[in-house]
């Protein structure tokens, strides 16, 4: 089931999924001057069986002879409102994603793809947050968010992370600014969750996560 809202925004932090649940969709976006081939796929889709998950469809970009005025399925990255890319210091560390059944690895790049990837997450997906360069983390709890579904409505849990500037006076837990409810929207109820998550196995995997390049976008 698609997660019909966006992971929370944490000031001075960015997030990354370490593996993608089956059902996740990745837009086939091309960089400026290129477009999807006429008969090309709109999305890649994480699919699989009990033993193996992989991305269906291949994204293909071709040169635009003239400026492409056709509206894309989603705006191109440079046309997105408040689109941000944050690069961390170290390259992505390898993660043993094969240990997560029902999940796909990060898809390999395709020729002339856009600089940022737009994913459509599904219920149960977990993303991990990290402070951007120049900020350090003050944790009150897990620096992750998971998409849950309650009464047919989806929401992301609130990551318990505050990113503070290294030159600023440290905030102690008792002095932290209040954040949004840990369970997202105030209207959400918690009495009838219909889905469970891969919390434990993904949390264990997150422990292996080093500083990464975070260029993932989402919808």
């Amino acid at each position: 089931e698609l997660c019909d809202d966006d992971p929370p925004e944490i000031p001075h932090a960015t997030f990354k999924a370490m593996a993608y649940k089956e059902g996740t969709m990745l837009n086939c976006e091309c960089k400026r001057g290129f477009r999807r081939i006429k008969s090309g796929s709109l999305y890649m889709l994480c699919t699989g069986n009990s033993s193996h998950s992989s991305w269906d469809n291949q994204c293909q970009c071709t040169s635009s002879a003239t400026r492409n005025t056709t509206k894309q399925v989603t705006p191109q990255p440079e046309e997105q409102k408040e689109r941000k890319t944050t690069e961390m210091q170290s390259p992505m560390q390898p993660v043993d994603q094969a240990s997560l059944p029902g999940h796909c690895r990060e898809p390999p790049p395709w020729e002339n793809e856009a600089t940022e990837r737009i994913y459509h997450f599904v219920v149960g997906q977990m993303v991990y947050y990290q402070c951007v360069q120049g900020y350090r983390a003050l944790h009150r709890g897990p620096a992750e968010s998971v998409c849950k579904m309650t009464h047919g409505k989806t929401r992301w849990t609130q990551p318990q992370l505050i990113c503070t500037g290294e030159m600023e006076t440290s905030q102690f837990p008792g002095e932290e600014k209040p954040q949004a409810s840990p369970e997202g929207r105030p209207e959400s109820e918690t009495s009838c969750l219909v889905t469970t998550t891969d919390f434990q196995i993904q949390t264990e995997m997150a422990a292996t996560m080093e500083t990464s390049i975070f260029t993932t976008e989402y919808q």
């Epitope: 019909d4 059902g23 999305y43 997105q80 599904v122 409505k153 919808q219």
Partner: antibody
Framework: QVQLVQSGAEVKKPGSSVKVSCKAS????????MHWVRQAPGQGLEWIGY????????LYNQKFKDKATITADESTNTAYMELSSLRSEDTAVYYC?????????WGQGTLVTVSS | DIQMTQSPSTLSASVGDRVTITCSAS?????MHWYQQKPGKAPKLLIY???NLASGVPARFSGSGSGTEFTLTISSLQPDDFATYYC?????????FGQGTKVEVK
């Protein structure tokens, strides 16, 4: 209580454009995506696309990507859908529906009639 | 795209009848959702995540199924239930609906 109130019926000439509005109240507008759904006379429901009001992100059904443009105005808690290059086949009732999962609240619908 | 095929397209029934509407998806989906629509009105959420009744929906409505085959059942049809019913999937984009099943008076 949650309410989605749409603009009134429109009669348009072929080739022209129309902009339908959907004013939301009773909840935090920016916390939920707004979806748009079309229903041609005597036909079923077709999903057009959505907007995330807080970021302006949009996603369209490929079928409508050259037909519809969805926008939102946070200051007035209003979502809009503009339909361009209208043809008689675009005659339909257009609904906005609150997202964030299943469509629990819908606008009353806006009938757009395209006729010469 | 995932195609949703409802059957029957039209169903003639009487008050008190047990009514069953089926919806087949062209690919496996995680959940099915159902909406009820009356003439000139917006659709109304009836059942979400396959089997959960939306707020205010009478217990005579029920939903079941998994994978590609799903069912909406009205155990004892009431006058207020004559309407068109749509199944809906939101497991993948584009979101799609069934073509509708009209429940009319026999």
């Amino acid at each position: 209580q949650v309410q989605l109130v749409q603009s009134g019926a429109e009669v348009k000439k072929p080739g022209s454009s129309v902009k339908v509005s959907c004013k939301a109240s009773g909840y935090t507008f920016t916390s939920y995506r707004m979806h748009w759904v079309r229903q041609a006379p005597g036909q079923g429901l077709e999903w057009i696309g959505y907007i995330s009001p807080n970021k302006g992100y949009t996603l369209y059904n490929q079928k409508f990507k050259d037909k519809a443009t969805i926008t939102a105005d946070e200051s007035t808690n209003t979502a809009y859908m503009e339909l361009s290059s209208l043809r008689s086949e675009d005659t339909a009732v257009y609904y906005c529906a609150r997202g964030g999962g299943v469509f629990d609240y819908w606008g009353q619908g806006t009938l757009v009639t395209v006729s010469s | 795209d995932i195609q949703m095929t409802q059957s029957p397209s039209t169903l003639s029934a009487s008050v008190g009848d047990r009514v069953t509407i089926t919806c087949s998806a062209s690919s496996s989906i995680s959940y099915m959702h159902w909406y009820q629509q009356k003439p000139g009105k917006a659709p109304k959420l009836l059942i979400y995540t396959t089997s959960n009744l939306a707020s205010g929906v009478p217990a005579r409505f029920s939903g079941s199924g998994s994978g590609t085959e799903f069912t909406l059942t009205i155990s004892s049809l009431q006058p207020d239930d004559f309407a068109t019913y749509y199944c809906h999937q939101r497991s993948t984009y584009p979101l799609t609906f069934g073509q509708g099943t009209k429940v009319e008076v026999k």
